[in-house]
């Protein structure tokens, strides 16, 4: 049976998500990220809130954070571009683009993920994959290897119930169910992938994990296509 991973998920197949990135601060995993172009990683803006004095780097081609792997490579960050409207105290516009110091060396374990450009909600009930190196159980344990979980998309009306997120979920956000299976601390910035396409980015707002009344919140990348394109241009 699956044991506590991401919360209720399991270890990912090694290098089966070649778009997966670990955004690191001073050599330690900070947040997830997703390679969206040869030289660009998409993550969450809040991830860099406390990074003012530290060295931010991006690890690509990794399954284990600690073990040597032929495909692993740590890239310096040339430029960090948070969404101009992101603010410390809200979950809105929680996106960050990191320009790598050079184009990533692509291969079977390192490859950009196509992202959704059509600004239409994912159908409720759609199973989407979220992966990351965030905490894996209620003790707060951090894994060494990449974890993933399949989560059904939750409709916005339910997510906005007073008992849930009480109207905070705008059209630019989406939710996924969080009943025991959930993204959690350290997964922020990572990808929510539906049908092989990047649909969402894990928001880094502080949230109780694994509680069905507090669904996972994800920034809808399609809603930010113009901004992403303008930065990558």
């Amino acid at each position: 049976p699956p044991r506590g991973r991401i919360l209720g998920g399991r270890e990912a197949e090694a290098h089966a998500r070649p778009y997966m990135a670990s955004v690191q601060l001073n050599g330690a995993h900070l947040c997830g990220g997703v390679l969206v172009a040869e030289q660009w990683v998409l993550s969450a803006a809040h991830c860099l809130e406390d990074a003012a004095d530290g060295k931010v780097q991006v690890l690509l081609g990794a399954h284990s954070l600690s073990q040597p792997e032929p495909s692993k490579r740590l890239y310096d960050v040339l430029r960090a571009v948070p969404h101009p409207d992101s603010q410390p105290d809200t979950i809105d516009h929680d996106l960050l683009l990191l320009q790598l110091s050079e184009k990533a060396t692509l291969g079977p374990a390192v490859r950009p993920l196509p992202w959704q450009r059509v600004d239409r909600d994912v159908a409720p009930g759609t199973l989407c994959d979220v992966a990351g190196w965030g905490i894996v159980n209620h003790a707060g344990r951090r894994p060494d290897s990449l974890q993933h979980v399949l989560l059904p998309v939750l409709d916005r009306a339910t997510c906005n119930r007073r008992t849930h997120h009480d109207g905070a979920i705008t059209e630019r956000l989406m939710c996924a169910e969080s009943n025991r299976r959930d993204s959690c601390k350290g997964d922020s910035g990572g990808p929510l992938v539906c049908g092989g396409v990047l649909e969402g980015v894990v928001t880094s707002g502080s949230r109780v994990c694994g509680n069905r009344k507090k669904p996972g919140i994800y920034t809808r990348v399609a809603s930010y296509a113009a901004w992403i394109d303008s930065v990558l241009a």
């Epitope: 506590g4 159980n137 003790a139 707060g140 951090r142």
Partner: antibody, heavy 113, light 106 residues
Framework: EVQLQQSGAELVKPGASVKLSCTAS????????MHWVKERPEQGLEWIGR????????KYDPKFQGKATITADTSSNTAYLQLSSLTSEDTAVYYC??????WGQGTSVTVSS | QIILTQSPAIMSASPGERVTMTCSAS?????MYWYQQKPGSSPRLLIY???NLASGVPLRFSGSGSGTSYSLTISRMEAEDAATYYC?????????FGGGTKLEIK
């Protein structure tokens, strides 16, 4: 190197309160959960509760609800355990632990008049 | 809440002997943690998620189990293994400890 340094032993009177501290080095407490555990002679270990220092969310064993209050200050990288209305039953060693992986050295609390 | 019962409460073993202790849960749990505690010292995490060895733990320690039955095994007892061992479940809140197994050296 990860370390958790707990405050010194306390001798307190019945009915009083005490606040224990646990200062972390080698990691940021807001990156994971901080737990508190009670140990009494011949009684084993009891999980008191935990805090997510990033947002202040706490969870307690119902047995310690009202008795224990866990807080954290991310600027000083410190977690706290406050115990109120102390009785002899609260005489114990209290440990803080980071994700139950790294443990402090323990703080002895003695309740006596 | 889930009650964890450890057995035996006290046991002794000779150096080199194989040691197994059990932790029985009152309801099914998905995984188990194990800790070692020596007198006057803090607990030390030995095993997480039922069977994974924590950093720096000797390979003679192993964990197994599922459902309501879990065990910790020391393949060859050493003098330094004399301690009290606790199981703890993280499946169902509140997260509870077992009462401990005290392992003595013969």
């Amino acid at each position: 190197e990860v370390q958790l340094q707990q405050s010194g032993a306390e001798l307190v009177k019945p009915g009083a309160s005490v606040k224990l501290s646990c200062t972390a080095s080698g990691f940021k407490i807001k990156d994971t959960y901080m737990h508190w555990v009670k140990e009494r002679p011949e009684q084993g270990l009891e999980w008191i509760g935990r805090i997510d220092p990033a947002n202040g969310n706490t969870k307690y064993d119902p047995k310690f609800q009202g008795k224990a209050t866990i807080t954290a200050d991310t600027s000083s990288n410190t977690a706290y355990l406050q115990l109120s209305s102390l009785t002899s039953e609260d005489t114990a060693v209290y440990y803080c632990a980071n994700a139950m992986d790294y443990w402090g050295q323990g703080t002895s609390v003695t309740v006596s008049s | 809440q889930i009650i964890l019962t450890q057995s035996p409460a006290i046991m002794s073993a000779s150096p080199g002997e194989r040691v197994t202790m059990t932790c029985s849960a009152s309801s099914s749990v998905s995984n188990m943690y194990w800790y070692q505690q020596k007198p006057g010292s803090s607990p030390r995490l030995l095993i997480y998620d039922t069977s994974n060895l924590a950093s720096g733990v000797p390979l003679r320690f192993s964990g197994s189990g599922s459902g309501t039955s879990y065990s910790l095994t020391i393949s060859r007892m050493e003098a330094e293994d004399a301690a009290t061992y606790y199981c703890q479940q993280w499946s169902s809140y509140p997260w509870t400890f077992g009462g401990g197994t005290k392992l003595e050296i013969k």
